[in-house]
């Protein structure tokens, strides 16, 4: 708690300006009026206050607004936002997209902090729905935010937002989320040529159906094993040996190292052994000649 001391003569702040960086903490507390601070918050971000001084300024705002800051103040918090706790932010009612952008800008380039997560949660709840503009903003700052949404929430993602997504941002997405995102990515990148299209769509292929994988196999895409291993098992199983060979290109030899892992293991079980032998990789476990292929649902029920 900062001492309550009288402001020295001649030091009462008439405006928020750079002279305040030379004030001691107790002088800031005594000489800066909280209402003046609130009306001139936009200046704070331009003045290189120390962290200790920012603590004093935050304390003054907390005293002025014990129920939570008004949006007019929140919009201009700047680096003072980094001093806020999730508990502070839960008191806010943020409705303006400009306010959200201003605060996300402060945290730009860093991982999503608990403060940012709380801010986004408050904003989305305040709006009542995750509209396209909000999602555009969030995916621009945090493309990985997509993977934190439910499939239902993802259904409102505009395809245009997909352009901001980087491969690593989908690392935490589960198959159900990729099922929703893949068609959107396909739509977003539909006007690109073959090789460029594959580079962009690659990260989303965990949601691709069999027919799309078959189509890709005709385009000499040379899919790497890491991508292949993330494909839906049910989408891979119907692919023929020839289609997988075309899909993987020179990477086909990597199947040997993955033969015990899904989806490769399950795919091998569905192929005729003599077809697998044509790959020359020594893959074992295919269907011997003369055997019938069981229906997929029957096979899963038996295993």
């Amino acid at each position: 708690e900062v001492e309550k001391t009288a402001c020295p003569s001649g030091k009462k702040a008439r405006e928020i300006d750079e002279s305040l960086i030379f004030y001691k903490k107790w002088e800031l507390e005594a000489c800066v009026d909280a209402a003046l601070l609130a009306t001139q918050m936009d200046r704070v971000n331009a003045i290189p206050f120390t962290y200790e001084q920012l603590d004093v300024l935050k304390h003054k705002l907390d005293e002025l607004y014990p129920q939570g800051y008004p949006e007019s103040v929140i919009q201009h918090l700047g680096y003072l936002f980094l001093k806020m706790s999730p508990e502070d932010i839960r008191k806010w009612n943020v409705t303006s997209l400009e306010t959200l952008k201003a605060l996300l800008e402060v945290n730009k380039g860093h991982e999503m902090s608990p403060q940012v997560a709380t801010l986004i949660d408050r904003f989305v709840k305040g709006r009542g729905q995750l509209d396209k503009d909000t999602l555009d903003t969030l995916t621009a700052f945090y493309p990985g935010y997509l993977c934190s949404l439910s499939p239902e929430e993802l259904s409102s993602v505009p395809p245009s937002s997909i352009w901001a997504v980087r491969p690593q941002d989908l690392d935490t997405c589960d198959p159900r989320q990729l099922d929703v995102l893949y068609p959107k990515a396909r739509l977003a990148f539909q006007n690109m040529n073959g090789s460029e299209y594959f580079v962009k769509i690659q990260s989303f292929l965990g949601g691709a159906p069999t027919e799309d994988l078959k189509a890709l196999s005709q385009q000499n895409v040379s899919m790497d094993l890491a991508t292949f291993m993330k494909l839906r098992t049910d989408a891979v199983l119907p692919l023929t040996v020839a289609e997988v060979q075309k899909l993987l290109g020179p990477h086909v030899e990597g199947l040997k190292a993955e033969e015990r892992h899904r989806p490769v293991r399950d795919w091998i079980l569905r192929q005729r052994q003599d077809d697998l032998d044509t790959l020359g990789l020594g893959l074992q476990g295919g269907i011997p000649n003369g055997y019938l292929v069981l229906d997929l649902s029957m096979q899963e029920a038996l295993s």
Epitope: E18, S19, F22, A46, I47
Partner: antibody
Framework: EVQLLESGGGLVQPGGSLRLSCAAS????????MSWVRQAPGKGLEWVSG????????YYADSVRGRFTVSRDNSKNTLYLQMNSLRAEDTAVYYC?????????WGQGTLVTVSS | QSVLTQPPSASGTPGQRVTISCTGS????????VSWYQQLPGTAPKLLIY???KRPSGVPDRFSGSKSGTSASLAISGLRSEDEADYYC???????????FGGGTKVTVL
Amino acid sequence: EVQLLESGGGLVQPGGSLRLSCAASGFTFSNYAMSWVRQAPGKGLEWVSGIPPDSASKYYADSVRGRFTVSRDNSKNTLYLQMNSLRAEDTAVYYCAKNMLSFDYWGQGTLVTVSS
Amino acid sequence: QSVLTQPPSASGTPGQRVTISCTGSSSNIGSNAVSWYQQLPGTAPKLLIYYNSKRPSGVPDRFSGSKSGTSASLAISGLRSEDEADYYCGSWDPSLNGYVFGGGTKVTVL
């Protein structure tokens, strides 16, 4: 009304010394950092030195460090610049200015000429 | 060689809009506020913009400042003959422990 009035400029030989003064009025001098900025004839602005209200630390441009000394007397509302070992390239109009991060008030300047 | 980079000159006819850029680095503009100064011929500089975009009282709203990343710009809209002057940008640079100016831009009204 804020006023800054520089004095002490003049002609000096290379290696010589001069002391510039800046008398301030119209604001609480002891609350504000102060700076010196110079401008060589036909050239741009060059920051020279800055001093916070309590003189706790002093800041200098590399070109003058070790030769110039900034000081202030808050009781007299005056800023000083002691210039030693002057060189021809120190020839300029010297301005004093209020603040250190954005100079909101400037004096009219005093001309320092270093020549033999 | 100035730490902040400005174009040496800019010009426009009366009524036009002129923009002056100021490019720095993460250690000055990137982390500190930018100011702009106007110096009319034969006079001392005058503060035109402070804290990136604020105008002191008495400065017409034809002058506006902005900052993005490590660059800043000054825009003069509705150019007038009395705007013919040298314009300097400036910012504190903690890595140098000092203030840095741009080389100045001479604005000519054609």
